[in-house]
Structure formats: C-alpha cells, structure tokens
Interface confidence: low
C-alpha cells in the first residue's frame, strides 16, 4: 500500500533505535571519510524530521522520497568537494540519477586506518559511560570500511557486541573475557561482509535474474521439502531485500527483511521443520538465525532427476514454452537433491543444461543429443571436489599460516603485477578457508570451500578493477561470477611477466618487528615472500622454503638478542646475501 509519508512509515515500522542505526549506516556507507560526529548530527536531524512526519504526514517535505531526503542532507554537507572530489558532482543531478551516482562512488578499499580495538578497560569505560554512542561508533566504523555491509545484519552484530560488553565488563578479567568473544564476532562479520559484497556484485553486474537463480539454488538446498512455488516466492522476496540493501535503500531493506522473516515463521509447515528455534528469537536474532538455518531433511522418495529433464519426451516443448520456469525447476530439483554441492557448482550445472537444450532442441533428434547431459556434468562436479581434497590435504599438512603462504606463492605467480598488499590480503583470506571449511563433515566441505573462495575472489576483482594491472586477473574477473573460481584455479605462472629486480631494502628489517603482534609479524613475512616470488617467479617451492626458514630463524635470533638493533644491522645484510644465493 502507498503511504503519504515514506519516512514516517519506515520510522513507525522499524522503531527509533533501528531507524537511527540504519540511517547512520547509510550515511557512513555513502560518505566514508566523514567523522562519527558529523554523521551523528545528520542522523539526529533526519530522526527529528521523521518524528514531525509521524505526528503529521502532511507536514512540509514529508511526502518526499527517502533518496531525496537523504541525498539533500548529504549534499548540504560543507566542504563536500574538498573532501570528496568528484562525488560532489552527484549533487548537480536529480533523483534517481543522484543516488546512482553516490553508489558509483562507494569505495571498496577506502584509505582508512585499520579499525583498532581499544584495550579492555578503556572500552568498558566508554561503553558504560554511553552505550548508545559507543555502538554508534561501532556502526560508523564498520559501515564506512564496508560500504556494502548488509545493514540489518550489521545491526545484529552491533547487538552481539553490546551483549558481549555488557557481560564481560562486569567480569574481573575483562581482557580474557572480551578478546575471544569479540574476535569471534569480528571474524563472522568480515565473512558476512565479503559474502554480501558478492551478492551486490551479482546484482550490479548481472541483474536480478542472476541473483534470483543464486537464491533459488540456496533456498532449495536448505528447504528441500518446500515446493517450487514456495521457493520461488522466497527467492523473489529475498531478491527484493538484497536489491534494496545493495542499492542503499536500507530502511526498506530492513523492513522487508523483517516481513520475510515473519512470513517464514508463519508458514513453517510449508517451508521447513527446522525453523522453530529461530522463530522463537527476537527480530534481529531471528532473521540472522533464519539466514543460516540448518538444511531440512531431504524427502526420502525423490525420483531420479533424469525422469523430468532427460527421459521425458516433452523436454524441448516444456523448455520452449517457458524457458525461465523450466530452467528454474531444473535448478530447484537438482539443488534440493544436492546440499553437498556449492551454489556456484549448481549454477554451472544449470548453465550447462541450458546450453545443451539450446543446442539440442534445434536438432533433428533432440533426445539423442541431450540424452548424455547428466554424464557431461561429471567433469564439472569432479573439478571442485578435487580442489577441496587437494587444498584440505595441504591445509592439514601445513596449518593455516603455512597454507596461506602456499596460496600466496601460487597467486603471486598467477598475477605478479598485483600489488603486494592486495596479494597478501587475498592469500590470508583465501587461506582461512582451511580453518573455516576443512574441519567440517565431508558433505559440507565443498559448499563451504567454493562459495567462500568465490566471495574472496570477488573482492580481489573489485580491488583490481580500480587499478587493472594483470591480464590474467582481468580475464577471470570479466567472465560470469560462477566461472571465476575455476578460472583463477586454472591460472598458471604468468609467462609475460618480467621479474622485479632484487632490492635489498625490500628485505631489510629492523628491531621494531619484534614487538609487533603475531598477525602483523606474519603479514611482514608474507610481504617479503610475495616480493621474493615477484623477483623469482619460477623459484621452486624448496628454494622459497629455504629462504623463508632462514628468514624466520633470523627473526627469532635477533628478537632474542640482547642488542637487537646491532643484530638486525649485522645479520640483515648476511640474510639478504644468503637469499640471493639460495635463489640464484
């Protein structure tokens, strides 16, 4: 139904707390350089205005669209051009072009310092003094660094953060209570960020149809007892929610997500037997829980997939009459039978099936032509299965850090032109797949590994788009989203790359490395490893291992030395010489 005042409608639906949180996220994601105080001021102004519209929907400007209201607020910020350059040009446009322009200026890799967590005492003090401001800072800092973070989910993580602080700040040993819990939330939030960015990329690059196909596959795996009409309804609703969030319509997105959660909980009987626990929770927890609910038990009596999609004499007729519905049904039926496959793989199979029908239904004897299609799926299925086996074996042998290093060497050889910080970030993220997925039961490994890798590689593509330097990466990033991971896996050493000359300063270290946290030390070592590979792209694994072992030994020795500075100054050049010799 149409509302006289959109802003009043959303304020009433969401309530003041969520309304303010979402407006803060929206502003922080659009204008990523502004301080918390600047955004907090705008949020207060918008909230005050929304309240006047709730009181009287006919009040001045209450009938304006949210884009108009928010855009006008952003464009009224002083010094917009000085701080944001050409983003200020967006303000010369009318809606909806103005909002599109803002979206195009979102920066996936803003030059902001890493979000540092204060030490426990300081954190608890500021949390106790003003919990609302504390959580506002959290939303602002995360949102500006992750401009496509799924807004209602960010509210959920803020709520988690709040609960952890409430609990741990009452403990004697705050530090040991907070650290593991907040690390857990951070890890989950970062994964959520790359997954959502992948969804927005799918929507932006390939449109709603592509996202809806993803949703059909995912929902069919989770709810194999729901019929095709139910899955289609859920996929349509989910597509709308994600389209809104990816488009910056965060109030609508959160509102529609709450509606979808409500619908699912009211229709459990036709969706899944596993929803009740989620449906007992309050809103944010409920929606989060539903988004990662365990798969329902598969019906025992499912017929073979071949019956309707290969053996049926009407295959070409059914396909011609309603292509999207027929292919959607195929995707639904195949996905509900295969919770052990990744969504990417299921979409590749559906694409292969579509291509086969396109070709075969134009021939004289279609059944003879498409009769072998399921057998032709085999290599497509084997490739990711082998990928999982090989990589999980390697992870189990090397551990997370060693596995990250193996990936770093591999990817630096594939795309040596990519900047070292990007390669290190990508390898560290890709390497976490081991810890995340390889410990899962066999039937959950493939979907976990491949869908996670796809999301990480999407980030690699986004960063590379800003400054394209590698033809290899451009080639893999230009194709369809579901083909990216196989494309990257198939890349080999870039033969056109001319190695970097050896610069001693790249491999020169000082005693300050000794006091760095373990993670920072690892990044320093991995940076050196990537630079070594750029210098010698065809170095063997043994050569690189020799150098890295020597490097680790050098750090260990000098960091334990009484006079660290002298040790680094004298042993450093020797290390550089040994490295050059080892690689010669």
């Amino acid at each position: 139904e149409a509302h006289k005042s959109e802003i009043a409608h959303r304020y009433n639906d969401l309530g003041e707390q969520h309304f303010k949180g979402l407006v803060l996220i929206a502003f922080s994601q659009y204008l990523q350089k502004c301080s918390y105080d600047e955004h907090a001021k705008l949020v207060q102004e918008v909230t005050d205005f929304a309240k006047t519209c709730v009181a009287d929907e006919s009040a001045a400007n209450c009938d304006k669209s949210l884009h108009t209201l928010f855009g006008d607020k952003l464009c009224a910020i002083p010094n917009l051009r000085e701080n944001y350059g050409e983003l200020a040009d967006c303000c010369t446009k009318q809606e909806p072009e103005r909002n599109e322009c803002f979206l195009q200026h979102k920066d996936d890799n803003p030059s902001l310092p890493p979000f540092e967590r204060p030490e426990a005492e300081a954190m608890c003090t500021s949390f106790k003094e003003n919990p609302t401001t504390f959580m506002g800072h959290y939303l602002h800092e995360v949102a500006r660094r992750h401009p496509y973070f799924y807004a209602p989910e960010l509210l959920y993580y803020a709520e988690q953060y709040n609960e952890i602080l409430t609990q741990c700040c009452a403990e004697a040993d705050k530090e040991s209570c907070l650290t593991p819990k907040l690390d857990g939330v951070k890890e989950k939030a970062l994964v959520s960020s790359v997954r959502q960015r992948m969804k927005c990329s799918s929507m932006q690059k390939f449109g709603e149809r592509a996202f809806k196909a993803w949703a059909v596959a995912r929902l069919s795996q989770t709810f194999p007892n729901a019929d095709f009409a139910e899955i289609t309804k859920l996929a349509t609703d989910l597509t709308k929610v994600n389209k809104e969030c990816c488009h910056g319509d965060l109030l609508e997105c959160a509102d529609d997500r709450a509606e979808l959660a409500k619908y699912m909980c009211e229709n459990q009987a036709t969706i899944s037997s596993k929803l009740q626990t989620c449906c007992d929770k309050p809103l944010l927890k409920k929606a989060h829980c539903l988004s990662e609910v365990e798969h329902d038990t598969m019906p025992a009596d499912l017929p073979a997939i071949a019956a309707d999609f290969v053996e049926d004499q009407e295959v070409c007729k059914n396909y011609a009459e309603a292509k999207d519905v027929f292919l959607g049904t195929f995707l639904y039926e195949y996905s509900r039978r295969h919770p052990d496959y990744s969504v990417s793989l299921l979409l590749r199979l559906a694409k292969k099936y579509e291509a086969t029908l396109e070709k075969c239904c134009a021939e004289a004897n279609p059944p003879a032509c498409y009769g072998t299609v399921l057998a032709e799926f085999q290599p497509l299925v084997e490739e990711p299965k082998n990928l999982v086996k090989t990589n999980c074996d390697l992870y189990e042998k090397l551990g997370e850090y060693g596995f990250q290093n193996a990936i770093l060497v591999r990817y630096t050889q594939k795309a040596p032109q990519v900047s070292t910080p990007t390669l290190v970030e990508a390898a560290r993220n890709l390497g976490r797949v081991g810890t995340k997925c390889c410990t899962l039961p066999e039937d959950q490994r493939l979907p976990c590994v491949e869908d996670y890798l796809s999301a990480i590689l999407n980030r690699v593509c986004l960063l590379h788009e800003k400054t394209p330097v590698s033809e290899h990466v451009t080639k893999c990033c230009s194709g369809s989203l579901v083909e990216r991971r196989p494309c990257f896996s198939a890349l080999t050493v870039d033969e056109t790359y001319v190695p970097k000359e050896f610069k001693a300063e790249t491999f020169t270290f000082h005693s300050d490395i000794c006091t760095l946290p373990e993670k920072e030390k690892q990044i320093k070592k991995q940076t050196a490893l990537a630079e070594l590979v750029k210098h010698k792209p065809k170095a063997t694994a043994e050569q690189l291992k020799t150098v890295m072992d020597d490097f680790a030994q050098f750090l260990d020795t000098c960091c334990k030395a009484a006079d660290k500075d002298t040790c680094f100054s004298t042993e450093g050049p020797n290390l550089v010489t040994r490295c050059k010799d080892a690689l010669a």
Partner: nanobody, 123 residues
C-alpha cells in the same frame, strides 16, 4: 642456436620517432612471449614492454605508455617497437629478449638477449 638481432636505433631529436626491429631465430618464436628492455648510460636494466606469443597480452612501463607500441609478425619471426614522441630520457641501449625454455627461475639472467641497438635522443 638462439639469435636475437636488434636494428633500427640511431640519433633523433626530441619529439621524433624510430622503429626498432628484432629478428629472431633458433627457437620457437611464435610460441614465445617477448620483451623489450633498455639500459640508459650508467643505469640498470629497465623493462619497457611485453607481448605474449599471440599478441593478445601487451603491456608497457608507465614511462613509455601512450608513446611506444610493441608488435610482432610471427610469420617473419620479428618483434617491433614503434617509438614516438621520443624524449631525452629515452636515450639507452634497447634489447629484445625472451625467456630461456625450461628456465626454473625468472630473472634477467634467464633470458636470451640480443646485442642491443643504441637510441640517442638529443636536440
């Protein structure tokens, strides 16, 4: 025996043009990536441009982008470098080079080189 013979160098005024050629023999030219590298007087080697075997991948150093064009003719086993808008800082010996087959480590030592051709840009 692998042979790379550069030609086309010479003296030219700033803003002028030259076309360097590199005749290759003794290896499978049509399946080899090729590079142009230069060495200015008293300086180290500097990569200029890369072209893949099928010429689909072409890359240039920032310093020459928009001014130099690399190309190849696989039928003639010849590599080219068209140099326009030449500047004083382009003065160098220009070498064409290719990876040694089967080389495990990729550094300049692992390339086959020509003898170079001198390009001098002065008013």
């Amino acid at each position: 025996e692998v042979q790379l013979v550069e030609s086309g160098g010479g003296e030219v005024q700033p803003g002028g043009s030259l076309r360097l050629s590199c005749a290759a023999s003794g290896f499978a030219f049509s399946t080899s990536g090729m590079v142009w590298v230069r060495q200015a007087p008293g300086k180290g080697l500097e990569w200029v441009s890369t072209i893949s075997d099928d010429a689909r991948i072409i890359r240039y150093a920032e310093s020459v982008k928009g001014r130099f064009t690399i190309s190849r003719d696989n039928a003639k086993n010849t590599l080219y470098l068209q140099m326009n808008s030449l500047r004083a800082e382009d003065t160098a010996v220009y070498y064409c080079a290719t990876y040694r087959a089967g080389s495990r480590i990729g550094s300049y030592e692992d390339y086959y080189w020509g003898q170079g051709t001198l390009v001098t840009v002065k008013p």
